[in-house]
């Protein structure tokens, strides 16, 4: 397929990479697949500076990331590696917490509304970001 | 004009599969998500899938999950769906459909005029 | 899954009638439904997406309202080309999901 060289409608470009941020709520899941299927994923924050851009663009608004436990150790949706990768949790997070009374802990991190992460139920439904690189070998998107 | 054209429908007998295909034209097809939607005899419709622009991505129907594949080939302007393990319930019109252009619109604008798939035995 | 539930799922009517037909999603789905019709032995037309907009070329006889989980089809003045089977759809999470099916027929 061709290279996508600039980034679909109503998404916004930022540092060779288009993100677009949703104004509604779904589970983690649901915007998962939302993501997926515009050919992208859920945002993979590789750097302070891409973490105070989505944080500026995000607002003070809990809003999923493409990070999670859901089967067992800590995962960035893309593959990239998050042992050794940027990370910003709240201070004591991320708890696993049981006790919010919803079955289970809690394994989808989320940026808070002061942009430092926490883990949370996947099933709340937050605001998500999606991410896609730009030059990687794909089919254009489409424009309305 | 757009078009969407099915072909690949016949009987089948059960656990036996099929591959339809779907032949798309007046419309840039690699900038568009596709469906596939099946309707039973005297029934309704009900979402069998959907496919991403590149083909990177696909969702099923629990109902088909693990039995039916779909796929494009953007350089041939074609669709498939291969369909394997077939079930007497499988039996329907199976109607290929392009989605609706807008970022999260999963709506189906364009339908093709749908092809037939019987299992019986 | 989101449960879409259409009713009535058959309906007798004259031509000039005013007819309406209701969606009720089991979840919010914000704006996220269509309408499509369906004449036998054909395949589904859109007609009306994200609740209220219509698609290209569709008469202004046919509206959709709602949003939430409550939603509506009307045609307001009935013709005798608008006796057929209306689907609403919802597309705000996958599965994506139909309603059963509204019959319009000729009384």
């Known amino acids: 397929g061709s290279e996508r060289t600039c980034c679909p409608v109503n998404w916004v470009e930022h540092e060779r990479s288009c993100y677009w941020f949703s104004r509604s709520g779904k589970a983690w899941a649901d915007a998962d697949n939302y993501c997926r299927l515009e050919d992208a994923h859920l945002v993979v924050v590789t750097s302070w500076e891409e973490q105070k851009f989505v944080q500026h663009h995000i607002g003070p608004v809990n809003t999923w990331m493409g990070l999670h436990d859901q089967n067992g150790p800590w995962k960035w949706v893309d593959g990239t590696d998050y042992e050794t990768g940027f990370k910003n949790w709240r201070p004591e997070q991320p708890d696993d917490w049981y006790g919010h009374g919803l079955g289970g802990g809690e394994d989808c991190a989320h940026f808070t509304d002061d942009g430092r992460w926490n883990d949370d139920v996947c099933q709340r439904p937050y605001r998500w970001v999606c991410e896609t690189e730009l030059d990687k070998a794909s089919q254009e998107p489409p424009l309305l | 004009q757009v078009q969407l054209v099915e072909s690949g429908g016949g009987v089948v007998q059960p656990g036996r599969s099929l591959r339809l295909s779907c032949a798309a034209s007046g419309f840039t097809f690699s900038s568009y998500g596709m469906h596939w939607v099946r309707q039973a005899p005297g029934k309704g419709l009900e979402w069998v899938a959907i496919?991403?622009?590149?083909?990177?991505?696909?969702f099923y129907a629990d109902s088909v999950k693990g039995r039916f594949t779909i796929s494009r080939d953007n350089s041939k302007n074609t669709l498939y769906l291969q369909m394997n393990s077939l079930r007497a319930e499988d039996t329907a019109v199976y109607y290929c459909?392009?989605?609706?252009?807008?970022?999260?619109?999963?709506?189906?604008?364009?339908w093709g005029q749908g092809t037939t798939v019987t299992v019986s035995s | 899954d989101i449960q879409m539930t259409q009713s009535p799922s058959s309906l007798s009517a004259s031509v000039g009638d005013r007819v309406t037909i209701t969606c009720q999603a089991s979840q919010d789905i914000y704006n996220h439904l269509s309408w499509y019709q369906q004449k036998p032995g054909k395949a589904p037309k859109l007609l009306i997406y994200d609740a209220s907009n219509w698609e290209t070329g569709v008469p202004s006889r046919f509206s959709g309202g709602g949003s939430g989980t409550d939603f509506t089809f009307t045609i307001s003045s009935l013709q005798p080309e608008d006796f057929a089977t209306y689907y609403c759809q919802q597309y705000e999470n996958l599965p994506l999901t139909f309603g059963g099916g509204t019959k319009v027929e000729i009384k």
């Open positions: 496919i991403s622009y590149s083909g990177r991505n696909d």
């Open positions: 459909a392009r989605r609706i252009a807008a970022a999260g619109h999963y709506g189906m604008d364009v």
